[in-house]
Amino acid sequence: PTDAPVSPTTLYVEDISEPPLHDFYCSRLLDLVFLLDGSSRLSEAEFEVLKAFVVDMMERLRISQKWVRVAVVEYHDGSHAYIGLKDRKRPSELRRIASQVKYAGSQVASTSEVLKYTLFQIFSKIDRPEASRITLLLMASQEPQRMSRNFVRYVQGLKKKKVIVIPVGIGPHANLKQIRLIEKQAPENKAFVLSSVDELEQQRDEIVSYLCDLAPEAPPPTLPPDMAQVTVGPGLLGVSTLGPKRNSMVL
């Protein structure tokens, strides 16, 4: 089904429009930002693998404005946002957009600039304080040092806004100094360092699980006293809106 244009009169029923694609399914309150390195340190074929990883991750998230909101940004010497946190589109449409992110193949991919963009554009206003805020920084290159002058300031600024930064270093040219710096800023800023894009698939479930464990479950819906005893027969609501308490993943 094609997506209807979003307007104030469009009623978009989220959460029951698309069933989960995997057993592994994160049903938490989370704002998740994917930052994709658009430098020539990744070949076009490797960039396709990187995008496939992002799409695979998105398949394991309960994407909606109520649960997991996602943003996707490709960065080079600037930043190009393909998906914003407030974009009201079906998960399948968001995955399609993520799969069509263009390969820039630029000489430089500035982590400082994209973290600045994340700090001042994506998380300029915190409109969902109850949700966890996580930035997944997929980095395969090193920006020139002169561009990194304010790098730590941006990482600290994100920390002040309670944005967790998870760097994923890919390949031999990833900036390990910056990765270690990010880790040093907050205990939740766990890094994943991979030797190539081929390891992304192996690490995917661990990364999704780690992200999901950092996010809170939604509080149970509060019912008025006269409705407290009402029960609904099995299967009537389709996909459950609440995952089991014991684990971050809806199995």
Epitope: Q145, R146, S148, N150, N175, Q178, R180
Partner: antibody, heavy 122, light 107 residues
């Protein structure tokens, strides 16, 4: 220990270019940045620009069009070149170590050379 | 560019005195401020970085404080070797800029 030593021409004619060499010891130019600062006679300090460990550069925008900073890591030397000199470029020129790095963001100029005096006069 | 204004421009004090030099920035510099000492022979040394952190080898009688646009350097017990000109410098934004200097003399 950390040392920086500038060597320059002393006297330069107006409209000519200035070349100063800074030779360093006690640290590697791949690990630290080097800045250039000047001080006209009886006046304050003015930051000119810097070269980072990876060779990337930053310049004072007021001087950028006539300034160039380069280096030779193997010789532990940093070079300042300034074109189209005028009399108000007369100053003592200092090269200074800068611990600027991905891991450092307190850009303090921590060790200074003794400076070399340059007079622009015909 | 960020303008840095130091006061006073010159100062006469007695040995053992407590001396304070002020530095004001034209905009908030978020504590990104250093202090330097220049001896009469032209030799320059870093004293304090990031407003209040003492550089290695600098005597503890030197201290720095401040925030926003207003900063100060204090010498708690003036010694003969402290006779020099003192400069503040901001590193909030390029280009780095220095104050005009404060020349410290002994009465």
């Amino acid at each position: 220990q950390v040392q920086l030593k500038e060597s320059g021409p002393g006297l330069v004619a107006p409209s000519q270019s200035l070349s100063i060499t800074c030779t360093v010891s006690g640290f590697s130019l791949t690990d630290y940045g080097v800045d250039w600062v000047r001080q006209p006679p009886g006046k304050g300090l003015e930051w000119l620009g810097m070269i980072w460990g990876d060779g990337s550069t930053d310049y004072n925008s007021a001087l950028k069009s006539r300034l160039s900073i380069t280096k030779d890591n193997s010789k532990s030397q940093v070079f300042l070149k300034m074109n189209s000199l005028q009399t108000d470029d007369t100053a003592r020129y200092y090269c200074v170590r800068d611990p600027a790095d991905y891991g450092n963001y307190d850009y303090a100029l921590d060790y200074w050379g003794q400076g070399t005096s340059v007079t622009v006069s015909s | 560019d960020i303008q840095m204004t130091q006061s006073p421009s010159s100062l006469s004090a007695s040995l053992g005195d407590r001396v304070t030099i002020s530095c004001s920035a034209s905009q908030d510099i978020n504590k990104y401020l250093n202090w330097y000492q220049q001896k009469p022979d032209g030799a320059v040394k870093l004293l304090i970085f990031y407003t209040s952190s003492l550089h290695s080898g600098v005597p503890s009688r030197f201290s720095g404080s401040g925030s926003g646009t207003d900063y100060s350097l204090t010498i708690s017990n003036l010694e003969p070797e402290d006779i020099a000109t003192y400069y503040c410098q901001q590193y909030e934004k390029l280009p780095w800029t220095f104050g005009g200097g404060t020349k410290l003399e002994v009465k």
